[in-house]
Amino acid sequence: MPMFIVNTNVPRASVPDGFLSELTQQLAQATGKPPQYIAVHVVPDQLMAFGGSSEPCALCSLHSIGKIGGAQNRSYSKLLCGLLAERLRISPDRVYINYYDMNAANVGWNNSTFA
């Protein structure tokens, strides 16, 4: 937590080495949270369409305890769409990102919760 999940039809072979690390570093910069709390999950090779086309696309989610809101989400979108375009060659207009502001009591970690 923060937790970023990317579902994409881009094949596994097209996901560059270091992509998970780069996502982690950039989310740490953007959220101000240490990398040890950031989880990323890239799910390639998915059967997907966006706008009726099977060109590269991504359906994503970012869960965080706080640090979610209008201006912040726009910043995250710029960052994450940029990374997906730069590294996976996915056009930003073929990306959806859902943002979830989690209650600390509803996030389990290390035998307990963050509450």
Epitope: Q29, A30, I65, K78, N110
Partner: antibody, heavy 118, light 111 residues
């Protein structure tokens, strides 16, 4: 080793513009945010805001919205602070500081002293 | 905005004594099982230097005489024992929320 080197002292008149540079070396510039901190003579530290070095997006503290602008030249690993329409009360030392993950400031520039006087 | 209140504003100690500086915040700076509170030392004419990050972690190269403690709204920087080189102003800073804010500073004089 990691270094942040700022441009030299500035003497300006009210109404003028100043651009202060902060050149980073020794680390991957785009992986860490860059902050700007002001310190008027004899006073404490005040966070002015930060710039995301990957997206180039600036965030300004309320007291520094309007005349202040952060920018980057990522190819030169350099961050800039521009202050327009200078006022006497802008007289201060301005520091750049790298955000480590967790937003603490682990490396600082040496500071740039700005004096605004007619 | 989160307000940080440092106390005392100044203190004068003899060599070998223990310095205790307090920083209280107007709301909790804890999240994700961490406290987003940090401490800096600034000497006249110099830039600030990071001492302690995330409340209790000693920055690399900082002597073990420095330690940090606390959580939520109450934090402490301790220097034990103080040395002549510790004469400086000390600032706390929170980064749990923007704007990132500093305390007003505590000036330490060594007698």
């Amino acid at each position: 080793q990691i270094q942040l080197v700022q441009s030299g002292p500035e003497l300006k008149k009210p109404g003028e513009t100043v651009k202060i540079s902060c050149k980073a070396s020794g680390y991957s510039f785009r992986n860490y945010g860059m902050n700007w901190v002001s310190q008027p003579p004899g006073k404490g530290l005040e966070w002015m805001g930060w710039i995301n070095t990957y997206t180039g997006e600036p965030t300004y503290a309320d007291d520094f919205k309007g005349r202040f602008a952060f920018s980057l030249d990522t190819s030169a690993s350099t961050a800039y602070l521009t202050i327009n329409n200078l006022k006497n009360e802008d007289t201060a030392t301005y520091f750049c500081a790298r955000s480590n993950y967790g937003n603490y400031f682990d490396y600082w520039g040496q500071g740039t002293t700005l004096t605004v006087s007619a | 905005n989160i307000v940080l209140t440092q106390s005392p504003a100044s203190l004068a100690l003899s060599l070998g004594q223990r310095a205790t500086i307090s920083c209280r915040t107007s709301e909790s700076v804890d999240s994700y099982a961490s406290s987003f509170m940090h401490w800096y030392q600034q000497k006249p004419g110099q830039s600030p230097k990071l001492l302690i990050y995330l409340a209790s972690n000693l920055e690399s190269g900082v002597p073990a005489r420095f330690s940090g403690s606390g959580s939520r709204t109450d934090f402490t920087l301790t220097i034990d024992p103080v040395e002549a080189d510790d004469a400086a102003t000390y600032y706390c800073q929170q980064s749990n929320e923007d704007p990132r804010t500093f305390g007003g500073g505590t000036q330490l004089e060594i007698k």
